[in-house]
């Protein structure tokens, strides 16, 4: 079972992931982003359910498409290049979800815009942070 220190580490990692996702959302929602309309045409797969750390498998599988869409944005909207930003997120996601490779993601029937996709995973992080005991 997780110890208080491992739970604290998990919360810190979730907070880091949350900040990264919020930074991306803020960057693409920036009124100066001329590519937003184009970015909104890309469709992302949403997890059928996302309430536990193992469901981060669904986020991991969508990180490559996310990087591709972020490459459309002006780099000045982000502190890091999309490749580095996504790499950082990937490291956190892998640590959080653990090494269980048999867990397969299931997706919702409806696809989402990049804004909806990011908001979903932001909600996920906020929910886990607030209810993890």
């Amino acid at each position: 079972a997780p110890t208080s220190s491992s739970t604290k580490k998990t919360q810190l990692q979730l907070e880091h992931l949350l900040l990264d996702l919020q930074m991306i959302l803020n960057g693409i929602n920036n009124y100066k982003n001329p590519k937003l309309t184009r970015m909104l045409t890309f469709k992302f797969y949403m997890p059928k359910k996302a309430t536990e750390l193992k469901h981060l498998q669904c986020l991991e599988e969508e990180l490559k498409p996310l990087e591709e869409v972020l490459n459309l944005a002006q780099s000045k909207n982000f502190h890091l290049r999309p490749r580095d930003l996504i790499s950082n997120i990937n490291v956190i996601v892998l640590e959080l979800k653990g090494s269980e490779t048999t867990f397969m993601c299931e997706y919702a029937d409806e696809t989402a815009t990049i804004v909806e996709f990011l908001n979903r995973w932001i909600t996920f992080c906020q929910s886990i942070i607030s209810t993890l005991t």
Epitope: P2, T10, K48, A108
Partner: antibody
């Protein structure tokens, strides 16, 4: 056949403690998230706590710090340790299995907790 | 927390009637809605999830629909054993929340 059987309910005084148990069978216990849901007399359903397959635990503000959910995979058992009980904790407590990608798919028959002086 | 507003809170109907129960959610939950049936003194049983898939063994007269923030449980032809209380629930995010319930009574 999936079965969940709760036990441990009873009458307890305000401020007292109680430990509920849920014995599970018919599925690979260690692979699933388990939850406790309660129902006050004449009221609706309220989610109380959950514990995932990695033993991370989740609970709402109403019980956090007072109730602790735990599991013993070797015994196929789920527990709810309830401390500092209040009159408003009086309810039927149900153990439920949370499916990996959907809702609470199987429920126990419930055990009654009464907090009264 | 996500709120679930279920309506009506109670209804009277006859055997053979078509019954519709609705659940309005305060934010989009991407179909992560389930419906449960509960009879007096018994545990809830899972009927519908996701939000239109019937659990194995549930009669075809029960159906679920909806998207976004509005969801519906329909009983196409009410049977004597269907008189019970029905609850919706969101499992999109913790804390899981339930609707207040709809009691279906005999007219």
């Amino acid at each position: 056949e999936v079965q969940l059987v709760e036990s441990g309910g009873g009458l307890v005084q305000p401020g007292g403690s109680l430990r509920l148990s849920c014995a599970a069978s018919g599925f690979t216990f260690s692979s699933y998230t388990l939850a406790w849901v309660r129902q006050a007399p004449g009221k609706g359903l309220e989610w109380v706590a959950a514990i995932d397959s990695s033993s991370y635990t989740y609970s709402p503000d109403t019980v956090r710090g007072r109730f602790t959910i735990s599991r013993d995979n070797a015994k196929n058992s789920l527990y709810l340790q309830m401390n500092s009980l209040r009159a408003e904790d009086t309810a039927v407590y149900y153990c439920a299995r949370d499916s990996n990608w959907d809702a609470l798919d199987y429920w126990g028959q419930g055990t009654t907790v009464t907090v009264s002086s | 927390d996500i709120q679930m507003t279920q309506s009506p809170s109670s209804l009277s109907a006859s055997v053979g009637d078509r019954v519709t129960i609705t659940c309005k959610v305060t934010e989009k939950v991407w179909g992560n809605v389930a419906w449960y049936q509960q009879k007096p003194g018994k545990a809830p049983i899972s009927l519908i999830y996701s939000p239109s898939l019937r659990k194995s063994g549930v009669p075809s007269r029960f159906s679920g629909s909806g998207s976004g923030t509005d969801f519906t449980l329909t009983i196409s032809s009410l049977q004597p054993e269907d008189f019970a209380t029905y609850y919706c629930q969101q499992y999109y995010t913790y804390p899981y929340t339930f609707g207040g319930g709809t009691k279906v009574e005999i007219k």
